[in-house]
């Protein structure tokens, strides 16, 4: 990773994909340390910050415009030379977003699949981006870029991740932008939790007081393992929601999370899965699905007084 | 959203010493550095320097050397203004403000009033 | 140190008047420069930055601009909520120095 004996490493922390507004650091790493450096940017705009200066270990630049966006190189102190210098860095590719509107991203076939699929994440809109790229939170390293594809007044671009493995999983967002400023990238599109199944042991899935009900009668799912799961996450068959509620160990050395469904009005088909706080987005394998009966008078829909969570936030910690 | 909390008002004697925190909320502290900026009464402002949160390496004005000590605790997301062998002269209001080598202060902490008077 | 030299002191208008405060700086800042908002009582609130990029949530009644020793901050419409104090400061080469402060006041 680092540079060449004479070459410097540069990188961003805690990402080259930073907001306009927004903050970041630039670290210039030279011959096994962070020492004095000079920063340059490849254009010369928006550069009068860093004439004759020199930044000790770091740079912090923000909060940034779009004049920011750009490829930065560094050079390292280096006393005994005749210039003083080091060679240039690595070039390294500052964007900055929230410069256009939002694309879209969606999932193909869906944002919730078994390790070792592949999915196609395609990033979408009605500008006319020329690129797309994406990225995933928490990364540092640069966003994957494809060329934006035109057909019927719309810009895309398909993103093929896979095989997956526990790595991939995370947050996904895309960016556009447009001819002339590579580096200048629209808002974010909505984030897209990308999760992968099958890696642990599936939990049991059963309900009180049974899987067939009265109309009317309170319902309770309860999902449970031997395996010391954090978090547990209820499917129901046709629903884009997931809901997750902490695991409680139980004293018969289980642990277990209850989803109260309240009164039952019609059933459907329920799965669980579990999770560990530190891969959020990584799940067990698939309970055995339950199938809930109500028996009585059908209704269209089932009241949940536990309220789903949102299409994102799957990924995120719960606190 | 972005908050910068100081620590309340310090009523000191010449010679004491104060600590003001600031700590930081909203954003990941790491990212940015924590300027810190002296409003004396009937002055205007005038900027004591800054530290780099991500490397812990401060920089002080020229007439801000010596008595005044920047410090971070990363684990609580604080930056510390020390002063010491204080004055008459010290008097004044002390605000933190989040920004960093470029020197354009985002967002402000509400200020600290340090008196010191014997 | 690079001295910001701020103009009015104080001014006074009425509400929907164009206010404009000037700042020299002693030696070319290359559009580093930024302005603040002081309301009594409260701390400052960035404005502007780089001359005239607005910072999150401020009002498009608020511009900026300039280059070279030269800067401007002006206000197309002012508003009763727009009394405060308003200080340039230059973010080109540290010490960062800021102006003197302009008063500004509604009739």
């Known amino acids: 990773l680092m540079g060449g004996q004479d070459k410097p490493f540069l990188s961003a922390r805690p990402s080259t994909v930073v907001p306009r507004g927004g903050h970041v650091a630039l670290q210039c790493h030279y011959r096994r340390g962070f020492n004095n450096f000079m920063l340059y940017k490849e254009d010369r705009s928006h550069v009068p910050i860093f004439h004759g200066r020199i930044f000790q270990e770091s740079f912090i630049m923000g909060p940034v415009t779009p004049a920011h966006a750009g490829t930065y190189r560094c050079r390292g102190s280096r006393p005994h030379s005749l210039t003083g210098w080091s060679a240039p860095s690595n070039p390294l590719v500052i964007m900055v977003t929230g410069n256009h509107r939002k694309p879209s991203l969606l999932a193909h076939p869906g944002p919730l699949l078994k390790s070792g699929e592949t999915v196609i994440l395609q990033c979408w809109s009605d500008v006319m981006f020329e690129h797309f790229f994406l990225h995933r939170e928490g990364i540092s390293e640069d966003p994957s870029r494809l060329v934006g594809q035109i057909h019927d007044g719309v810009s895309k671009a398909n993103f093929s991740i896979g095989p997956l493995m526990p790595v991939l999983a995370g947050t996904y967002r895309c960016y556009g932008s447009v001819p002339h400023s590579p580096y200048q990238l629209s808002a974010p599109s909505d984030p897209l939790d990308i999760v992968i199944t099958g890696l642990y042991e599936k939990p049991s899935l059963s309900a009180q007081p049974g899987p067939t009900v009265q109309a009317g009668e309170n319902v309770t799912l309860s999902c449970s393992s031997w395996s010391s799961y954090d978090i547990y996450h209820l499917s129901r068959e046709g629903e884009a929601h997931e809901r997750r509620l902490r695991a409680v160990p139980k004293v018969n050395r289980t642990f277990q999370a209850d989803f109260p469904l309240g009164p039952a009005t019609h059933g459907g088909t329920y799965r669980c899965f579990g999770s560990f706080r530190a891969l959020p987005c990584v799940w067990s394998n698939s309970s055995d699905p339950l199938l809930v009966s109500v028996t009585g008078n059908p209704s269209s829909s089932w009241p949940s007084p536990t309220e789903p969570s949102s299409k994102s936030g799957i990924c995120r910690h719960l606190h | 959203q972005i908050q910068l909390v100081q620590s309340g008002s310090e009523l000191k004697k010449p010679g004491a010493s104060v600590k003001v925190s600031c700590k930081a909320s909203?954003?990941?502290?790491?990212?940015?550095?924590m300027q810190w900026v002296q409003k004396s009464p009937g002055q205007g402002l005038e900027w004591i320097g800054w530290?780099?949160?991500?490397?812990?390496?401060?920089k002080y004005a020229e007439d801000f050397k010596g008595r005044f000590a920047f410090s971070l605790d990363t684990s609580v997301s604080t930056a510390y203004l020390q002063i010491s062998s204080l004055k008459a002269e010290d008097t004044a209001v002390y605000f933190c403000?989040?920004?960093?080598?470029?020197?354009?202060?985002?967002?402000w902490g509400q200020g600290t009033t340090v008196t010191v008077s014997s | 140190d690079i001295v910001m030299t701020q103009s009015p002191s104080f001014l006074s208008a009425s509400v929907g008047d164009r206010v404009t405060i000037t700042c020299k700086a002693s030696?070319?800042?290359?559009?580093?420069v930024a302005w603040y908002q002081q309301k009594p009582g409260q701390p400052p609130k960035l404005l502007i930055y780089?001359?005239?990029t607005r910072h999150t949530g401020v009002p498009d009644r608020f511009s900026g601009s300039g280059s070279g020793t030269d800067y401007t901050l002006t206000i197309s419409s002012v508003q009763a909520e727009d009394v405060a104090v308003y200080y340039c400061?230059?973010?080109?080469?540290?010490?960062?120095?800021f102006g003197g402060g302009t008063k500004v006041e509604i009739k």
């Open positions: 403000a989040r920004g960093g080598d470029e020197g354009v202060m985002d967002y």
């Open positions: 909203g954003y990941t502290f790491t990212t940015a550095g």
């Open positions: 530290i780099n949160s991500h490397s812990g390496v401060p």
């Open positions: 030696q070319d800042v290359s559009t580093a």
């Open positions: 780089w001359t005239s």
């Open positions: 400061q230059q973010h080109y080469s540290t010490p960062w120095t």
